[in-house]
């Protein structure tokens, strides 16, 4: 169950999808990827206050225990709930191949 | 691909399964759960240094971009890779019911 979508910390501060532009060099891919030369990486960034976008029962438990034992139990974390596929043109021993990765770009986010 | 399982920060410091004992009161469940009275909550806690238990390509990207832009991109986060089911004996309007929850206890952990 995705719980609250209202961010008590203010607009844009809570767990949500962000886009970060990265070159092949930034990603450490320059030696094995030919294209794209730049990737618009979508990733999940932001705080996970109490019950905000709680992914499941485990996330709700984590929130409760973090409130009780903040030094022992971390707050839930903002991570991808699903992904968008992306194709990469890769160098191979003999030339190039096209490979689709299903777990590269975040599609939406939740707290867990 | 689960990458390295060697923790460079020292034994037990990296992302792994921990058990936290919690009462129904701790969890905020006292008003709707009868049993168990105490839960051994297994959860994922610990640091996610470079490529440690990287869940997928997205986690590897996150590691690279965190190294470049630590103020913008957070490090990967230690979260459940899978769950163990657990049964709760719940209060109902008419008595009790047994409900199995598939997403309550972490079974193993990875970084994402």
């Amino acid at each position: 169950a995705r719980n609250g979508d209202h961010c008590p910390l203010g607009p844009g501060r809570c767990c949500r999808l962000h886009t970060v532009r990265a070159s092949l060099e930034d990603l450490g891919w320059a030696d094995w990827v030919l294209s794209p030369r730049e990737v618009q990486v979508t990733m999940c960034i932001g705080a996970c206050p109490s019950q905000f976008r709680a992914a499941n029962m485990h996330a709700q438990i984590k929130t409760s225990l973090h409130r009780l034992k903040p030094d022992t139990v971390p707050a839930p974390c903002c991570v991808p709930a699903s992904y968008n596929p992306m194709v990469l043109i890769q160098k191979t021993d003999t030339g190039v191949s096209l490979q689709t990765y299903d777990d590269l770009l975040a599609k939406d986010c939740h707290c867990i | 691909a689960r990458n390295g399982d060697h923790c460079p920060l020292g034994p037990g410091r990296c992302c792994r399964l921990h058990t936290v004992r919690a009462s129904l009161e701790d969890l905020g469940w006292a008003d709707w759960v009868l049993s168990p009275r105490e839960v051994q909550v297994t959860m994922c806690i610990g640091a996610c240094p470079s490529q440690f238990r990287a869940a997928n390509m997205h986690a590897q990207i996150k590691t690279s971009l965190h190294r470049l832009k630590p103020d913008t991109v957070p490090a990967p986060c230690c979260v459940p890779a899978s769950y163990n089911p657990m049964v709760l004996i719940q209060k109902t309007d008419t008595g009790v019911s047994l409900q199995t929850y598939d997403d309550l206890l972490a079974k193993d952990c990875h970084c994402i």
Partner: antibody, heavy 118, light 107 residues
Framework: QVTLKESGPGILQPSQTLSLTCSFS??????????VDWIRQSSGKGLEWLAH???????RYNPSLKSRLTISKDTSSNQVFLKITSVDTADTATYYC??????????WGQGTSFTVSS | DIVMTQAQKFMSTSVGDRVSVTCKAR??????VAWYQQKPGQSPKALIY???YRYSGVPDRFTGSGSGTDFTLTISNVQSEDLAEYFC?????????FGGGTKLEIK
């Protein structure tokens, strides 16, 4: 495996609108980096790139034909469409669609022959 | 538009020979060049990407080289099934443009 197949009316009269369909399988236009191009081939002008459309609906056209071209897609039915308005005899050609991954056109359809005849 | 010139419209070769098909860009296109093979009655087939990278499944007797304005497709140990027309294409800038093609004839 990846396949593309073009379909069209075969023959039209001058000034009519040509509607072409590319039906494909083996890939999805929901995948970042994927696209479909249209290219035509005639004995007079050789291979001529017409347009392409990407997964994110980014569209590019050959400037020499831009005012007459419209490319669109139906992601759910794995189809890409090209419309060419006001056809004349210079548009007589074989029309191909090709899969694009970023800047690589790696698979082409078998082509559909089109003639403008009065 | 960037004009891609394949000066030789026809080339004649024998089975087992080595042949080089050339392509010249009117301006610098880096390595943003592809090569295609079109057999009689068929659609073009992609051979080379980024001037020198063979697509998977393309025999290693096909080799691409060059950068800037001068590009070459070399076929070593020519086979009878290589009878085809070969096209270069630049994708450095819009509109993408093709060379006029070089027909390879087998003696």
């Amino acid at each position: 495996q990846v396949t593309l197949k073009e379909s069209g009316p075969g023959i039209l009269q001058p000034s009519q609108t040509l509607s072409l369909t590319c039906s494909f399988s083996g890939f999805s236009l929901t995948t970042s980096g994927m696209g479909v191009d249209w290219i035509r081939q005639s004995s007079g002008k050789g291979l001529e790139w017409l347009a392409h459309i990407y997964w994110d609906d980014d569209k590019r056209y050959n400037p020499s034909l831009k005012s007459r071209l419209t490319i669109s897609k139906d992601t759910s039915s794995n189809q890409v469409f090209l419309k060419i308005t006001s056809v004349d005899t210079a548009d007589t050609a074989t029309y191909y669609c090709a899969r694009r991954a970023w800047d690589a056109m790696d698979y082409w359809g078998q082509g559909t022959s089109f003639t403008v005849s009065s | 538009d960037i004009v891609m010139t394949q000066a030789q419209k026809f080339m004649s070769t024998s089975v087992g020979d080595r042949v080089s098909v050339t392509c010249k860009a009117r301006q610098n296109v880096g390595t943003n060049v592809a090569w295609y093979q079109q057999k009689p009655g068929q659609s073009p087939k992609a051979l080379i990407y980024s001037a020198s990278y063979r697509y998977s499944g393309v025999p290693d007797r096909f080799t691409g080289s060059g950068s800037g304005t001068d590009f070459t497709l070399t076929i070593s140990n020519v086979q009878s099934e290589d009878l085809a027309e070969y096209f270069c294409q630049q994708y450095n800038s819009y509109p993408y443009t093709f060379g006029g093609g070089t027909k390879l004839e087998i003696k």
